[in-house]
Amino acid sequence: LVLDFNNIRSSADLHGARKGSQCLSDTDCNTRKFCLQPRDEKPFCATCRGLRRRCQRDAMCCPGTLCVNDVCTTMEDATPILERQLDEQDGTHAEGTTGHPVQENQPKRKPSIKKSQGRKGQEGESCLRTFDCGPGLCCARHFWTKICKPVLLEGQVCSRRGHKDTAQAPEIFQRCDCGPGLLCRSQLTSNRQHARLRVCQKIEKL
């Protein structure tokens, strides 16, 4: 597998992308930011635009809104128009937050065009963000899409590199976080090969 990295940057760059930092695309910017490309300057991460502000694309609008007819509009207002064909920035840094994918540079939302209004996504269905998935699921990347995946249970591997990533294809398979009452911790093991393996473990009460 080969990835074309023309439009993305390293995790370190992405993690540091805040207002004013340079970007190549919206995915380079953290949550509530988008990649603004002024005519005579280099593109930079700018704060998302609120309701009724002018926009050219969904990523320019703050979470919960999208760009309809060049204006940031609430999802409820836009749903009948777009049949939920949405594409909105949702770049929350998610480590340790139940129900979010375990990955440093969480990508933008992926649409689901035919879900009936109000119905939550099931496992394997396309999603926009975790809100669109049913209980016990989160919205996470799988290959070139985002789908609803189960939140991790006790004993399940939660390492960032839990999947067979390759040098050419890092982090194209996101995992959800550990479920409620669980933390992602290194597994105590005598086998040095698995020393870095992290699993979901119960939070010990003090």
């Epitope: 919206d26 995915t27 064909q85 933008k108 065009i113 396309s126 799988h142 899409t145």
Partner: antibody, heavy 120, light 111 residues
Framework: EVQLVESGGGLVQPGGSLRLSCAAS????????ISWVRQAPGKGLEWVAS??????????YYPDSVKGRFTISRDNAKNSLYLQMNSLRAEDTAVYYC???????????WGQGTTVTVSS | EIVLTQSPATLSLSPGERATLSCRAS??????????INWYQQKPGQAPRLLIY???KQGSGIPARFSGSGSGTDFTLTISSLEPEDFAVYYC?????????FGGGTKVEIK
């Protein structure tokens, strides 16, 4: 209604080039991943290339069998997907389908296909 | 890469009969609590059509007579009662690992 219509197939000599197109309609094209899958005569299906939607930075993906020879690209303004095929070989002879992943992670909508024949 | 082996290569049945198609993976295609296996139907001269994804979930507009089951490495597509339009080639596909791969197909023909 979701529609994918491929074009650009034809007869080409080994070592030659061809550019396939896929015109999409019925959905917000730029938001979705879209792929090329091929099928050699009388054979099974083989994934050829994919490009993610705007939310994942339009990243491109290829199997080893075509990497360096094929290039997938998209023109979101024209709702079109392309496959530039260079250094074509006899084994690239196939029907080429474009397929998209709208409702789930699988290839849930397909075009009717366009035939590419590589022969001298 | 993950190799998918479908059996039988050909299944000869009559309308109304039950069809059971098998797909075996060279390694587990389960991850994140999901079986990343899909089933497609293809009729002569037509594009494939998604029947089942995530092992057992029906694609849009797929009749209830089509069902998928299995986990790990062994998966089954069942057509509870064959209709005349069901005679076609069926492919399984894995989308757990890169590259995505397809099985060789099972042809369901009229006996």
């Amino acid at each position: 209604e979701v529609q994918l219509v491929e074009s650009g197939g034809g007869l080409v000599q080994p070592g030659g080039s061809l550019r396939l197109s896929c015109a999409a309609s019925g959905f917000t094209f730029s938001s979705y991943a879209i792929s090329w899958v091929r099928q050699a005569p009388g054979k099974g299906l083989e994934w050829v290339a994919s490009v993610s939607g705007t939310g994942l930075g339009f990243q491109t993906y290829y199997p080893d069998s075509v990497k360096g020879r094929f290039t997938i690209s998209r023109d979101n303004a024209k709702n079109s997907l392309y496959l530039q095929m260079n250094s074509l070989r006899a084994e690239d002879t196939a029907v080429y389908y474009c397929a998209t992943s709208l409702e789930n992670y699988a290839f849930d909508y397909w075009g009717q296909g366009t035939t590419v024949t590589v022969s001298s | 890469e993950i190799v998918l082996t479908q059996s039988p290569a050909t299944l000869s049945l009559s309308p109304g009969e039950r069809a059971t198609l098998s797909c075996r993976a060279s390694e587990s295609v389960d991850d994140f609590g999901i079986s990343f296996i899909n089933w497609y139907q293809q009729k002569p001269g037509q594009a494939p059509r998604l029947l089942i994804y995530a092992g057992s979930k029906q694609g849009s507009g797929i009749p209830a007579r089509f069902s998928g089951s299995g986990s790990g490495t062994d998966f089954t597509l069942t057509i509870s009662s064959l209709e005349p339009e069901d005679f076609a080639v069926y492919y399984c596909q894995q989308l757990k690992e890169v590259p995505p791969t397809f099985g060789g197909g099972t042809k369901v023909e009229i006996k």
